[in-house]
Amino acid sequence: DYKDDDDKFRDCAEVFKSGHTTNGIYTLTFPNSTEEIKAYCDMEAGGGGWTIIQRREDGSVDFQRTWKEYKVGFGNPSGEYWLGNEFVSQLTNQQRYVLKIHLKDWEGNEAYSLYEHFYLSSEELNYRIHLKGLTGTAGKISSISQPGADFSTKDGDNDKCICKCSQMLTGGWWFDACGPSNLNGMYYPQRQNTNKFNGIKWYYWKGSGYSLKATTMMIRPADF
């Protein structure tokens, strides 16, 4: 943990600009309070300064969590984790952020989706996701429903389907009804990862039944 007691950083871009250019876990401070949170900072990819808000890589962490757990975050920042909707909401309402989603399949291929504008609404509005300006190699159509699906969990059903997407597909996500993605679905190992309706899905790259090997969601200020 690379926290300097005198430093207060809102995101990994501020950490980077302060001279800390090594990948690792840093302590960040909530924009609207003195509350702190630990996050993994990617200081190498695409110029660095990326705050990792989600990572899946080995199935070691259970992502079928409650609303509160998705709100405050869970897992291990050095491995699989969810940073926390409340922190991300506060952060992305301070200034303009970009969201990059990096994906790996089981055949050694990688792809990404980059959204030039990203923010989460407040908890009052169910951490609705807002995205614009899609580019990248993981599909020309957004695999996150646009505009603005609300976040849903197993105990917080805000989707547009009578089926309760979070219970059916597992994990908390911006499901819509139930939508073309779920990066928080069940982790399936290689050779068990096809024809899985409740896996780690990014439809406009790998189709509906393919469960991915690894995913990373990262954010950075647009003016970095």
């Epitope: 309402n93 303009r96 504008h117 923010y119 609404s121 407040s122 009052e124 509005l125 609705r128 807002h130 614009k132 300006g133 899609l134 580019t135 020309k140 159509i141 957004s142 646009q146 505009p147 603005g148």
Partner: antibody, heavy 121, light 107 residues
């Protein structure tokens, strides 16, 4: 249901300021989204003028930047357009509208019915 | 600013026809393009957003497609109530800009 209603004078003299009000019902303008002014000239050309976001930040069309101001009154759930130094070329139907994104320009899903403004002496 | 060139300006069609309107952006607009319908005496109404997504309650005879610089809007089977002006709009970059409009008239 979300409703927007424009109001203001239908006739403004050249060189004066045009002031319009948009009253929003069914949704708080501080909750989310951006709140826009768009105008439609005779001949149907549409021009985006600017917005005020739910957080209070503003963005304006560069072609109007020196003349335009968008403000709000959160207690009344209203936002306002002021356009200074008007000329007859500002004659148009003025619409307020909600856009689907809160921090940047976007498509607009709810529109007012429009108010016609003529600039003439 | 991105210029949206919309064609044609006028479409004269019969009920039941299929119609297509195109919009060409002067530079890439990704998929951040919307289509609006404006009936006589009314304000514009959102039909399509993000190039291909149908807005809530919009009949499925209205479709949109495209990415980058070339966008298409189609009505599969024109009905009498579709008489209107149709506009495209890009919101990929600020300021958002509109096409000049296509007036759909029923024979």
């Amino acid at each position: 249901d979300v409703q927007l209603q424009e109001s203001g004078p239908g006739l403004v003299k050249p060189s004066q300021s045009l002031s319009l009000t948009c009253t929003v019902t069914g949704y708080s303008i501080t909750s989310d989204y951006a709140w826009n002014w768009i105008r439609q000239f005779p001949g149907n050309k549409l021009e985006w003028m600017g917005y005020i976001s739910y957080s209070g930040s503003t963005s304006y069309n560069p072609s109007l930047k020196s003349r335009i101001s968008i403000t709000r009154d959160t207690s009344k759930n209203q936002f306002f357009l002021q356009l200074n130094s008007v000329t007859p070329e500002d004659t148009a139907t003025y619409y307020c509208a909600r856009s689907t994104f809160g921090h940047y320009v976007s498509s607009m899903d709810y529109w007012g019915q429009g108010t016609s403004v003529t600039v003439s002496s | 600013s991105i210029v949206m060139t919309q064609t044609p300006k006028l479409l004269l069609v019969s009920a039941g026809d299929r119609v297509t309107i195109t919009c060409k952006a002067s530079q890439s607009a990704s998929n951040d393009v919307a289509w609006y319908q404006q009936k006589p005496g009314q304000s514009p109404k959102l039909l399509i957003y993000y190039a291909s997504n149908r807005y809530t309650g919009v009949p499925d005879r209205f479709t949109g497609s495209g990415y980058g610089t070339d966008f298409t809007f189609a009505i599969s089977t024109v009905q009498a109530e579709d008489l209107a002006i149709y506009f495209c709009q890009q919101d990929y970059s600020s300021p958002p800009t509109f096409g000049g409009g296509t007036k759909l008239e029923i024979k």
